[in-house]
Structures are given as C-alpha cells and as structure tokens.
C-alpha cells in the first residue's frame, strides 16, 4: 500500500520539489485535518506558508472567534489561514514571520520577525515576536510585548472599548494599538484618515489604509 | 469623509498671542478627543493639548502649561487652542488630529501619537522679533 505524503508546511512542499506558487493541502504531523493553503515559493528563497492576505476587499475580515480560528476565505486571494492550524504549527518549530505591506502609491515594504509563534486558543492565541528587521519601520507595529488575540464576540484587548468591533477585524489588539491588517478595506483616494482601515503605523503612520498585505511564515532553519 | 483643517498660524513677535483654530467634519466632537501636536524643523512631532469633551478632560504638555489654553465649541465642531506668551521655541507647524474618544488603555487618561488617525495639513506659526 502506497504512503501518502503529507507536509505541515510550504517549506516541505518545496522541498519535496514542488517549486511552483499555488494553493496545497497541508496537514499537521499526528492530524488527519486539512487545510489549504497558499504557498509562495518564489519570494526569497521560496518555502512560505501565507497566512494572511489583503488585496482587494473581496472578503469580509470582520468575523467571529471561531471564524479567526478555523480560517476563512480564499487561498488563492484574500484569506485568514486560521488560528488554530498556526498555533500548532509555530509551537512545533521555530518559525519566522515575514509581512509584505504594498501602499497605493505603488510603493512596498515588509517587516522581518526572526521568531514568532502564537499561543494555543486556551491563552487566546497571544502572538510573541522577537528580532524585528526590515524596511517596514524600526519599530514594531504589533504592539510589544505580544497581546491576546480578539475578534467581534471574543474582547480580549487592553481598551475601556472594543477594540475588534471599533476598528472591525480580528486582530491582537493593545489599546487599540499601532497595527491592524485586519481592518477594512478602503480604495484609493478613500484611504486616508481612517479609524478602521489596514494600519501599520511604523510605516504609513496614522490613518493610513493600505492597498496590500501578506502575512507568511517559514521555518527558521530553512 | 473625516475632515481636520487647521487655521490660524502665522508670525508673531515674542510675548504675543495667537488662537489657532481646528474645523472638524465627517464626526462629532462628542465622541472624539482632539489633541493639537506642533513639528519644528528636523524634530520630532510632540504633543501640545488635547481635549475629551465628553468628560471635559483637557491636556498640556508642561512646556505650554500656564501659557496655551485648549477649548471647544461643539456647535461649529471647532477646537481652539489659544496661545499666550509666545516664545521663539514655540515655532513650528502645528498640528490637530482626532482619535475615538473610547480608544483609552485601562488606567490610562491620554492617548499614544499613533492612536490618532485622522490629521489637518496644518498651520505655520513662527515667534520672532
């Protein structure tokens, strides 16, 4: 009986010679449960797992706990991955997070996090960063240290508000903090001066809504 | 569509007096706290004053403190920040934003710089003799 092979991550796809961008099934080491997955296999060096994606506001990021979770939308365009599968993933291995932020004036920038993993859901997935590089700003614009993930129905931020509903999206959220790439979705010419958009304040700074963001992962010693 | 148009700048001679006014549109002072921030040449943006007219809560950074008076007029959603005693380290672009008044860390009373989402274009305001 043949074996099937599985990967837990774009960094095995690719180094199982699948060397292509595209949408692949994942699944964690001791799991029978699924999910698909874009995988970027091109930018430096190739081997990542996208976990977020902001486009073109085709998807509404404004969702429930379970939704952040389990993930939404699609892996070919805009999507969450899920909460869950990223959890386990990033306490199974060291990991490194890469976010790629594009503004409409055609201009791009990421921020580089040599260690990132997230909390399992008992902790509220709590993100921890370390080793910030990049072009994206000096600073981090997730607040540090780390915060516990909220969404609409979930408010676990450090605000007398709600930051998930006053900002809309699922996001870690301090009070309410200098990110939120979960935000909405403003077109150009309708993107400045926003409470609610897709913020990274290190490098657009306040009120600024971004065109593009991608958050991917990839193992640290890949 | 959010809106903040400053006004009001201009030169002045060491000792004297101006009132800077900020119009806000697309909101309601109510619901919104607004800080004035001032920028000098190859400086860093700081805050001046802030108000929270839901509560009356009013701001000033110690170097403005006895000197600059911030208030509201919530029936033309205008901020005013009048500014005594003019010195020529008080030169600058000022400056007015807004930020959701709820948007507070618990025990905390003001705001962080990048909290402040929308921003006038502002205003020049030079002290000199």
């Known amino acids: 009986k043949e074996e099937q092979i599985s990967f837990r991550d774009c960094a095995e796809v690719f180094k199982s010679g699948h060397t292509t961008n595209g949408v692949y099934t994942l699944t964690l080491p001791n799991s029978t449960e699924e999910v698909k997955a874009y995988c970027d296999m091109e930018a430096g060096g190739g081997g990542w797992t996208i976990i977020q994606r902001r486009e073109d506001g085709s998807v509404d990021f404004q969702r429930t706990w379970k939704e952040y979770k389990v993930g939404f939308g699609n892996p070919s365009g805009e999507y969450w991955l899920g909460n869950e599968f990223v959890s386990q993933l990033t306490n199974q291995q060291r990991y490194v997070l890469k976010i790629h932020l594009k503004d409409w004036e055609g201009n791009e920038a990421y921020s580089l996090y040599e260690h990132f993993y997230l909390s399992s859901e008992e902790l509220n997935y709590r993100i921890h960063l370390k080793g910030l590089t990049g072009t994206a700003g000096k600073i981090s614009s997730i607040s540090q240290p780390g915060n516990d993930f909220s969404t609409k129905d979930a408010d676990n931020d450090k605000c007398i508000c709600k930051c998930s509903q006053m900002l809309t999206g699922g996001w870690w959220f301090d009070a309410c903090g200098p990110s939120n790439l979960n935000g909405m979705y403003y077109p150009q010419r309708q993107n400045t001066n926003k409470f609610n958009g897709i913020k990274w304040y290190y490098w657009k700074g306040s009120g600024y809504s971004l065109k593009g963001t991608t958050m991917m992962i990839r193992p640290a010693d890949f | 569509e959010v809106q903040l148009v400053e006004s009001g700048g201009g030169l002045v001679q060491p000792g004297g007096s101006l009132r800077l006014s900020c119009a806000a549109s697309?909101?309601?002072?109510?619901?919104?706290?607004i800080g004035w921030f001032r920028q000098a040449p190859g400086k860093e943006r700081e805050g001046v004053s802030s108000i929270r007219d839901n509560d009356g809560s009013t701001y000033y950074a110690d170097s403005v403190k006895g000197r600059f008076t911030i208030s509201s007029d919530n029936s033309k959603n205008t901020v005013y920040l009048q500014m005594n005693s003019l010195r020529p380290e008080d030169t600058a672009v000022y400056y007015c934003?807004?930020?959701?008044?709820?948007?507070?860390?618990?025990?905390?009373?003001?705001?962080?710089?990048?909290?402040?989402?929308?921003w006038g274009q502002g205003t020049l305001v030079t002290v000199s003799s």
């Open positions: 934003a807004a930020v959701p008044a709820g948007r507070l860390r618990f025990g905390e009373q003001w705001y962080p710089l990048y909290e402040y989402d929308a």
């Open positions: 697309g909101f309601t002072l109510d619901d919104y706290a």
